[in-house]
């Protein structure tokens, strides 16, 4: 299987880094978006704190933490109503991430 | 240091049912699926099923009804409903990774050292 | 159901040799595949994941190669310590119809 330059293979995802108007104050140079090229039944999500295909189930029904989410070794908890998950390091740190 | 101990692996009679429990150490079961893997003695490896973080289960075709996966925040216990006697087997607990690029496809990298069931009349 | 089928069953090499294991899947599992190696009493341990990626701390002499359903474990120079059974593992977690996951039957290798 064959791709063409700038074709994703499917399933996959990539980190895009855009160029802002340097001319715009307050406004960072550079931002990220994801680019993902997903399957049938697919949806972009996290895992492992990256861009990724995700089954389109987890997002549904909002079980976060089933798309792995958090990096590895840290544990996953969904937020109160599932708004959202924390992960959480070894050391007891938690970020806490909101989905919108 | 990351790693996975089964226990409650004994002899029991058919019919009688019997829960293994896997404690992990060293990393949060809440971060990673989880899977009950067994091998009968002599013979190739056999996938029962696996737990996902919500605690949602998927199983192997033939294990279906015949065994349970459940958790807790420490363990991943697999339960055998109905033991019969081709169900004498080494069972072992093992965490899954996965490779994100293309998905969730799966690999185990960590395993426990298995725990033995036997059952007979 | 997704069916492994690994093949030889086993193989006996002479230390120094290559030794190849194919595992053919019955569908497309989209590079999906692990490879494990197992030793007499001991639980197995990964070599190989997403077909062709080392797991860290095993030997360079093993590699992984396929795509689609066709997939190649190679030990290349194989030495005495590989005297052991290697399964392959195939399928995908989470997809649309849940996860499916089936190991091959095994391939037995002897180092004469």
């Known amino acids: 299987q064959f791709l063409k330059e700038g074709q994703l293979a499917a399933g996959t995802c990539e980190i895009v880094t855009l160029d802002r108007d340097s001319s715009q104050p307050r406004i960072e140079e550079r931002s990220q978006t994801a680019r993902c090229a997903c399957r049938k039944g697919q949806i972009a999500g996290t895992t492992r704190a990256r861009p990724a295909c995700v089954d389109a189930r987890i997002i549904k029904t909002k079980q976060w933490c089933d798309m792995l989410p958090c990096l590895e070794g840290e544990g996953c908890d969904l937020l109160i109503n599932r708004s959202g998950w924390t992960c959480t390091q070894p050391g007891g740190r938690i970020k806490t991430t909101t989905v919108s | 240091q990351e790693q996975l101990v089964e226990s409650g692996g004994r002899l029991v009679t058919p019919g009688t049912p019997l829960t293994l429990s896997c404690t992990a150490s060293g990393f949060f079961l809440s971060g990673y699926y989880m899977s009950w893997v067994r091998q009968a003695p002599g013979k190739g490896l056999e996938w029962i099923g696996i737990i996902y973080p919500s605690g949602s289960t998927d199983y192997a075709s033939w294990a279906k009804g015949r065994f349970t996966i459940s958790k807790t925040s420490t363990t991943v216990d697999l339960k055998i409903t109905t033991p019969t006697t081709e169900d004498t087997a080494t069972y072992f607990c093992?965490?899954?990774?996965?490779?994100?690029?293309?998905?969730?496809?799966?690999?185990?990298?960590?395993w426990g050292p298995g725990t033995l069931v036997t059952v007979s009349l | 159901e997704l069916v492994m089928t690994q093949t030889p069953p086993s193989l006996s090499a002479s230390v120094g040799e290559t030794v190849r294991i194919r595992c053919l899947a019955s569908e497309d599992i989209y590079s999906g595949i692990s490879w494990y190696q197992q030793k007499p009493g001991k639980p197995p341990t990964l070599l190989i994941y997403?077909?062709?990626n080392l797991e860290s701390g095993v030997p360079p002499r093993f590699s992984g190669s396929g795509s689609g359903s066709d997939y190649t474990l190679t030990i290349g120079g194989v030495q005495a310590e590989d005297a052991a059974t290697y399964y392959c593992?195939?399928?995908?977690?989470?997809?649309?119809?849940?996860?499916?996951?089936?190991f091959g039957a095994g391939t037995n290798v002897e180092i004469k």
């Open positions: 093992a965490r899954v990774a996965g490779y994100v690029g293309y998905g969730y496809e799966t690999f185990f990298d960590i």
């Open positions: 997403g077909a062709s």
């Open positions: 593992l195939g399928g995908v977690t989470y997809s649309s119809t849940g996860t499916h996951l089936t």
